[in-house]
């Protein structure tokens, strides 16, 4: 079970929203806090530690889910071409 | 099967650009991210650099880095290297490579192309 | 870089294991690829167990604590050529960057 703790969103800059959100789950033995259909989950650590992030389907349905080269996150882009970039901190 | 055909080799001069192409076939190209590695006359595997599926992010190796832009062609299935400010140590075959799954490392790649030699020299 | 040795014989039917070792711990696993003269590498081992399914099931990958092995339990002929290692290499300046060992020349008598 998980809960959003905070979430900030940032408009200023054109074309581009910044959010930031925390999320609090209680969570099984061997998992741990993720995202899964764009919205808090518990997930296997095993994806956390290797950074395997599109392992967690953490897309919308329909999306399709790209790992950053550098693993620092993923990004979910959608039928009509949209990138959603999210960064894990 | 999977088929990658790369072209654009061949004798290329000193301080000069090349444009290399990686023609896919087989699979859903959008779906994988790609990557160059190159191999010098008589030398083992060097890694060259990836792309992700949309091609908005790429890395590269240190080797290339500055002089090397990776791209690809979704509706044509189609991925490209570009590199300037050739040197004869970028003498070597490029191979096109696919990653297995939704990420490619030097551990995942599960196809690779023919390879197509580039010579740098005057 | 990784390390693996340069060569290893062996007699037709008998099980081969080349070893590799370094790179960073990505969660990626390791990869093995097989390249004769003149062709290019071809993937028998990728993500430390995974087999194309056009190579033989006498390929295997496994993962010991740092040590990679790639075994060949019954070489063929065929089977001789040199064997890279792949796997990741992390540093501050480039981020994760793949790395490859320098070759494994298996010879098969």
């Known amino acids: 079970t998980c809960e959003i703790v905070t979430l900030d969103r940032d408009s200023s800059q054109p074309r581009r929203t910044i959010a930031r959100q925390t999320a609090r789950c209680a969570c099984r033995k061997g998992q741990i806090a993720g995202t899964t259909r764009a919205r808090p989950a518990c997930v296997d650590a095993r994806i956390i530690k290797t950074k395997q992030w599109c392992d967690m389907l953490p897309c919308l349905e329909g999306e399709g889910c790209d790992l950053l080269i550098n693993r620092s996150g993923w990004t979910c882009t959608q039928p009509g071409g949209r990138i959603k970039t999210t960064t894990v901190s | 099967a999977v088929t990658l055909d790369e072209s654009g080799g061949g004798l290329q001069t000193p301080g000069g650009a090349l444009s290399l192409s990686c023609k896919a076939s087989g699979f859903t190209f959008s779906s994988y991210q790609m990557g160059w590695v190159r191999q010098a006359p008589g030398k083992g595997l060097e890694w060259v650099g990836v792309?992700?599926?949309?091609?908005?992010?790429?890395s590269y190796g240190s080797a290339v880095k500055g002089r090397a832009t990776i791209s690809r062609d979704n509706g044509q299935s189609t991925l490209y290297l570009q590199m300037n400010n050739l040197r004869a140590e970028d003498t070597a075959v490029y191979f096109c490579?696919?990653?297995?799954?939704?990420?490619?490392?030097?551990?995942?790649?599960?196809?690779w192309g023919h390879g197509t030699e580039v010579i740098v020299s005057s | 870089a990784l390390t693996q040795p340069s060569s290893v014989s062996a007699n037709p039917g008998e099980t081969v294991r080349i070893t590799c070792s370094g790179g960073?711990?990505?969660?990626?696993?390791y990869g093995w690829y097989q390249q004769k003269p003149s062709s290019a590498p071809l993937t028998v081992i990728y993500?430390?167990?995974e087999r194309p399914s056009d190579i033989p099931s006498r390929f295997s990958g496994s993962s010991s604590g740092s040590t990679h092995t790639l075994t060949i339990t019954g070489v063929q002929a065929e089977d001789e050529a040199v064997y890279f290692c792949?796997?990741?290499?992390?540093?501050?300046?480039?981020?994760?960057?793949?790395?490859f060992g320098a070759g494994t020349t298996l010879t098969v008598l």
């Open positions: 960073a711990s990505s969660g990626y696993g």
């Open positions: 792309i992700n599926k949309s091609g908005s992010d790429t």
């Open positions: 792949g796997n990741d290499d992390y540093s501050s300046d480039s981020g994760y960057v793949g790395v």
């Open positions: 490579a696919k990653g297995s799954a939704s990420y490619i490392t030097a551990a995942t790649i599960d196809a």
């Open positions: 993500k430390d167990d």
